[in-house]
């Protein structure tokens, strides 16, 4: 059947240096798996920015921090039967 | 392939300015980054710059004195050093970032290296 | 800053044996770790990505585990050729270190 998601590690406030590289964790559990999903201030976090990669574990990397990556980031973990949110603030300075 | 050159001995404070020439890749669609090996064998992480050199990255340890550049029409990558300090010395290679899936940051060509020693 | 730590420094063993390097982390990496070989004299090649990925022109007797802060190289049925320097790196957020490096050697 399926269970809604629970997100068991979210992403964690922090500073980043520009131009480095961060990371924010989402781990979730749930049934069917969670599909996972991230927003910056609301908006659609785009993959097609070749600075910015899924990789595994619910982890998104940004390459490359800019000034303009600053802003309040949130995990969306789906299933079928709900969703969970989860945010943190970046501050790329 | 890829061929460093421009290395030496340099005095402290001095600059140097390091070559990267590629070839056999469609090099203006891979990011590049500079590695060096210390003396005690140990590696180091120096610059990486993207695919169009529009963003670079640098560690505090070379921040402010090192800049690494490309030139995409002419297949080459630099690294200008300056103030240049004893524990810069070091072997430098140039290498090219894999393209993976997933897209974990490997570096999947490297060059010869060229020697940088800072003496006086 | 992630630090990495590996060991052994050093290793000697004999033709045909397996051997395991490990690499820890002073922070949780979620896989985000790559292994590289340094033959004497010559530059560093790619072994390993993501952990467990293996490059694509490596030999199967290599192999990566691990997750979270612990991580591991396999080297099964140990040849001459595998002499070397490996290194980890962690490739999670910058800085991206790298450990220290352990030497293989042949009995």
């Known amino acids: 059947g399926s269970m809604g998601p629970v997100i068991r590690q979210g992403p964690v406030n922090q500073t980043v240096a520009v131009d480095g590289t961060f990371v924010l964790s989402c781990v979730a559990t749930g049934s069917p798996v969670p599909t996972i999903l991230w927003r910056k201030d609301g908006v659609l976090v785009s993959t097609q920015d070749s600075r910015i990669k899924q990789l595994e574990n619910g982890v998104l990397q940004i390459r490359y921090a800019k000034l303009g990556d600053t802003g309040r980031y949130t995990c969306i973990a789906s299933t079928p039967s709900g969703e969970a949110t989860w945010s943190a603030y970046i501050e790329v300075q | 392939q890829l061929v460093e050159s421009g290395g030496g001995v340099v005095q402290p404070g001095g600059s140097l300015k390091l070559s990267c020439a590629a070839s056999?890749?469609?090099?203006?669609?891979?990011?590049m980054s500079w590695v060096r090996q210390t003396p005690d064998k140990r590696l180091e992480l120096v610059a990486t710059i993207n695919s169009n050199g529009g963003s670079t990255y640098y560690p505090d340890s070379v921040k402010g004195r090192f800049t690494s550049s490309r030139d995409n029409a002419k297949n080459i990558l630099y690294l200008q050093m300056s103030s240049l300090k004893s524990e810069d010395t070091a072997m430098y290679y140039c290498?090219?970032?894999?393209?993976?899936?997933?897209?974990?940051?490997?570096?999947?060509?490297w060059g010869q290296g060229t020697s940088v020693t800072v003496s006086s | 800053d992630i630090q990495m730590t590996q060991s052994p420094a050093s290793l000697s063993a004999s033709v045909g044996e397996t051997v395991t390097i490990t690499c820890g982390a002073s922070?949780?990496?979620?896989?985000?770790l790559t292994w590289y070989q340094r033959k004497q004299g010559k530059s560093p090649q790619l072994l390993i990505y993501g952990a467990i990925n293996l490059a694509d022109d490596k030999s199967s007797r290599f192999s990566g585990s691990g997750s979270g802060r612990q991580y591991s190289l396999k080297i099964s049925s140990l040849h001459p050729d595998d002499v070397a320097t490996y290194y980890c790196?962690?490739?999670?957020?910058?800085?991206?270190?790298f450990g220290s490096g352990t030497k293989l050697e042949i009995k």
């Open positions: 790196q962690n490739v999670l957020s910058t800085p991206f270190t």
């Open positions: 056999g890749f469609t090099f203006s669609t891979y990011d």
């Open positions: 922070e949780n990496i979620a896989g985000a």
């Open positions: 290498a090219r970032e894999a393209l993976l899936r997933p897209p974990y940051y490997a570096l999947d060509y």
